[in-house]
Amino acid sequence: KELKVTQPEKSVSVAAGDSTVLNCTLTSLLPVGPIKWYRGVGQSRLLIYSFTGEHFPRVTNVSDATKRNNMDFSIRISNVTPEDAGTYYCVKFQKGPSEPDTEIQSGGGTEVYVLAKPS
């Protein structure tokens, strides 16, 4: 099946201090390689989460990514702050014969708006 990375929401709004879910699904796990979430694009993009076993404070996977046929790579960001605002991209990589892996497809991006916490 042809690989497609889908981020269904173009944007989400979340109150500061709350949690938000950023959805991402794949149509294929091939070619093998990691899935990572970034905020922003280009050289200055920031790694938010990687499905390769490392620990990321405040960010967790939504579904059980250890399922061998898992296609859901959605993440939950907890205790959102204004600094978390920006556009988040779910990115599929193909493993490389040497570092780094090759980016092969990105979702369309989900913009996160952080609303002031109601007083």
Epitope: L29, L30, P31, V32, T52, D64, T66, K67, R68, K95
Partner: antibody
Framework: DLQLVESGGGVVRPGESLRLSCAAS????????MSWVRQAPGKGLEWLAG????????YYIDSVKGRFTISRDNSKNSLYLQMNSLTAEDTAVYYC???????????WGLGTLVTVSS | ALTQPASVSANPGETVKIICSGG??????YGWYQQKSPGSAPVTVI????KRPSDIPSRFSGSASGSAATLTITGVRVEDEAVYFC???????????FGAGTTLTVL
């Protein structure tokens, strides 16, 4: 310190059943997929079965499908292998192993010996 | 099936390469497992083609390309004498497989 300790091995007769256990410590067991791998005397390693972190998804090599069942109890940090209708060909050391994110193995238990003999 | 040589030998300080072939690069990740005696617990020396666990010496390295993976031991030591199994996970079939093992003798 990360530890995987298998138990439940022993001598059984052909056709009998055995349940192996693997006690995990030193890591967040509920976050990792796990597998069982065996090694027959004088032979190489053979992967048998794997289970997702939550326990809902299981995977088997064809030769043990329907006879062996992998399961886990995350509240007890334990992995299990139920083995039915055992034959002499199942004689081996059985290892539990922790899976990496891409379903290879990073840590192994010391193994438990299963001998099937009449 | 994964294919690897039955045995290799080297003098201390030499570089050893063990090649494991038979996987499909598009769908396969490789690992390497060291077993010092039959029935003893395997030790992972490489996973994810080229990732070395933190407690494994830097003389062990791995690579993969095409349909093969390579374990390289640079400056082999007597204590590296063991059987080395290559292993693979196939993302197409969801199955793990192992090679038959390579016995490394350090002369």
């Amino acid at each position: 310190d990360l530890q995987l300790v298998e138990s439940g091995g022993g001598v059984v007769r052909p056709g009998e059943s055995l349940r192996l256990s693997c006690a995990a410590s030193g890591f967040t067991f509920s976050s990792y997929a796990m597998s069982w791998v065996r090694q027959a005397p004088g032979k190489g390693l053979e992967w048998l079965a794997g289970i997702s972190a939550g326990g809902s998804d299981t995977y088997y090599i064809d030769s043990v499908k329907g006879r062996f069942t992998i399961s886990r109890d995350n509240s007890k940090n334990s992995l299990y292998l139920q083995m039915n209708s055992l034959t002499a060909e199942d004689t081996a050391v059985y290892y539990c192993a922790r899976e990496t994110w891409n379903h290879l193995f990073d840590y192994w238990g010391l193994g438990t010996l299963v001998t099937v003999s009449s | 099936a994964l294919t690897q040589p039955a045995s290799v030998s080297a003098n201390p300080g030499e570089t050893v390469k063990i090649i494991c072939s038979g996987g499909d690069y598009y769908s396969t990740y490789y690992g390497w497992y060291q077993q010092k005696s039959p029935g003893s617990a395997p030790v992972t020396v490489i996973h994810s083609d080229d990732k070395r666990p933190s407690d494994i010496p830097s003389r062990f390295s791995g690579s993969a390309s095409g349909s093969a993976a390579t374990l390289t031991i640079t400056g082999v030591r007597v204590e590296d004498e063991a059987v080395y199994f290559c292993g693979a996970y196939d993302g197409r079939t969801y199955i793990n497989t192992f090679g038959a093992g390579t016995t490394l003798t350090v002369l």
